[in-house]
């Protein structure tokens, strides 16, 4: 169960979807991808305070134990809950192909 | 594709499964769980250096962009790749029940 969406740290500080513009060179793809030349990469960034967007029971446990043992147990982490597919025009041995990747762009985020 | 399992930071420093002993009180479960009194919580802890146990393409992108923009893009994070189920004897309005939880104990870990 997705828990509270209210960020106690202030607007935009907690785990949410961000867009980062990146070139093929930035991504290290220039040698095998032809297009797009630039990608609007959606990724999950932000803090995961107590019970904020807790993905599951494990995240809730992690929050509790982090409170008790902050040096041993890290806080939950902001990661993709699901992905949007994306196509790349990529080089092959014989030319090019259009390839779909299902795990490239974050669609929404949760804490785990 | 799960990438390299060699930790460049030294043995045990990178993302892996850890066991943390926790009481019902530690977990905040004392008011609704009867048994077990103590749980061996398995969780994912450790650093995620470049391409170490990268869960998918998104994790690889995150590594590349973190290297370029460390203040904007965080490094990948060590999270469960799968879970082991666990049963709890929990209090109900009428007595107790045996309930299985599928998302409580980490089974193995990856970086995302």
């Amino acid at each position: 169960a997705r828990n509270g969406d209210h960020c106690p740290l202030g607007p935009g500080r907690c785990c949410r979807l961000h867009t980062v513009r990146a070139s093929l060179e930035d991504l290290g793809w220039a040698d095998w991808v032809l297009s797009p030349r630039e990608v609007q990469v959606t990724m999950c960034i932000g803090a995961c305070p107590s019970q904020f967007r807790a993905a599951n029971m494990h995240a809730q446990i992690k929050t509790s134990l982090h409170r008790l043992k902050p040096d041993t147990v890290p806080a939950p982490c902001c990661v993709p809950a699901s992905y949007n597919p994306m196509v790349l025009i990529q080089k092959t041995d014989t030319g090019v192909s259009l390839q779909t990747y299902d795990d490239l762009l974050a669609k929404d985020c949760h804490c785990i | 594709a799960r990438n390299g399992d060699h930790c460049p930071l030294g043995p045990g420093r990178c993302c892996r499964l850890h066991t943390v002993r926790a009481s019902l009180e530690d977990l905040g479960w004392a008011d609704w769980v009867l048994s077990p009194r103590e749980v061996q919580v398995t969780m994912c802890i450790g650093a995620c250096p470049s391409q170490f146990r990268a869960a998918n393409m998104h994790a690889q992108i995150k590594t590349s962009l973190h290297r370029l923009k460390p203040d904007t893009v965080p490094a990948p994070c060590c999270v469960p790749a799968s879970y082991n189920p666990m049963v709890l004897i929990q209090k109900t309005d009428t007595g107790v029940s045996l309930q299985t939880y599928d998302d409580l104990l980490a089974k193995d870990c990856h970086c995302i």
Epitope: Q40, N84, V87, V96, L98, L105 | -
Partner: antibody
Framework: QVTLKESGPGILQPSQTLSLTCSFS??????????VGWIRQPSGKGLEWLAH???????YFNTALKSRLTISKDTSNNQVFLKIASVDTADSATYYC??????????WGQGTSVTVSS | DIVMTQSHKFMSTSVGDRVSITCKAS??????VAWYQQKPGQSPKFLIY???YRYTGVPDRFTGSGSGTDFTFTISSVQAEDLAVYYC?????????FGGGTKLEIK
């Protein structure tokens, strides 16, 4: 596998609006980088690109025809629509829709024939 | 708009011959030219991307080259099934534009 199929009225009269539908399967218009384009071909002549629409709803049009063209999509039903206003006999052609991945048009429909006649 | 010109409307060749079709852009399009094949009664088929990259499944007898304004599409050994019209298209900028087509006839 990827398939596209165009449908239209077949025959219509000058000054009417031509409405075309492209129904497709095997890909999704919610995928980053994917679009659907419309191209036409008058009988015995060459290809003319008309318009395309992207996954993010960005739209591009043939310069000469821009004022008469409308393109839209229904992502959940895998359909793209093209409307051409105020048709005349010069709009008689076979109309194709094609799947696009960025600047590749790799799969084309079989085409639908449109005749404008009074 | 960028104008794509295929100077030969028709080209005649024999099975086994090498044939080259040219296409000229009205301005520099870098390598952003695609080639399509349209057989009689069929829809166009995508062959070449970005001047020289063969698309998945396209036989290796089909090649493309060129950059800037001058582009060439070559069939190294013509087969009977290559009877078709071949179109170049610039994908450098919208509006995308096609050449007028070159009809390959088999002697």
């Amino acid at each position: 596998q990827v398939t596209l199929k165009e449908s239209g009225p077949g025959i219509l009269q000058p000054s009417q609006t031509l409405s075309l539908t492209c129904s497709f399967s095997g890909f999704s218009l919610s995928t980053y980088g994917i679009g659907v384009g419309w191209i036409r071909q008058p009988s015995g002549k060459g290809l003319e690109w008309l318009a395309h629409i992207w996954w993010n709803n960005n739209k591009y049009f043939n310069t000469a025809l821009k004022s008469r063209l409308t393109i839209s999509k229904d992502t959940s039903n895998n359909q793209v629509f093209l409307k051409i206003a105020s048709v005349d006999t010069a709009d008689s052609a076979t109309y194709y829709c094609a799947r696009m991945g960025y600047d590749i048009m790799d799969y084309w429909g079989q085409g639908t024939s449109v005749t404008v006649s009074s | 708009d960028i104008v794509m010109t295929q100077s030969h409307k028709f080209m005649s060749t024999s099975v086994g011959d090498r044939v080259s079709i040219t296409c000229k852009a009205s301005q520099d399009v870098n390598t952003a030219v695609a080639w399509y094949q349209q057989k009689p009664g069929q829809s166009p088929k995508f062959l070449i991307y970005s001047s020289s990259y063969r698309y998945t499944g396209v036989p290796d007898r089909f090649t493309g080259s060129g950059s800037g304004t001058d582009f060439t599409f070559t069939i190294s050994s013509v087969q009977a099934e290559d009877l078709a019209v071949y179109y170049c298209q610039q994908h450098y900028s919208t509006p995308w534009t096609f050449g007028g087509g070159t009809k390959l006839e088999i002697k």
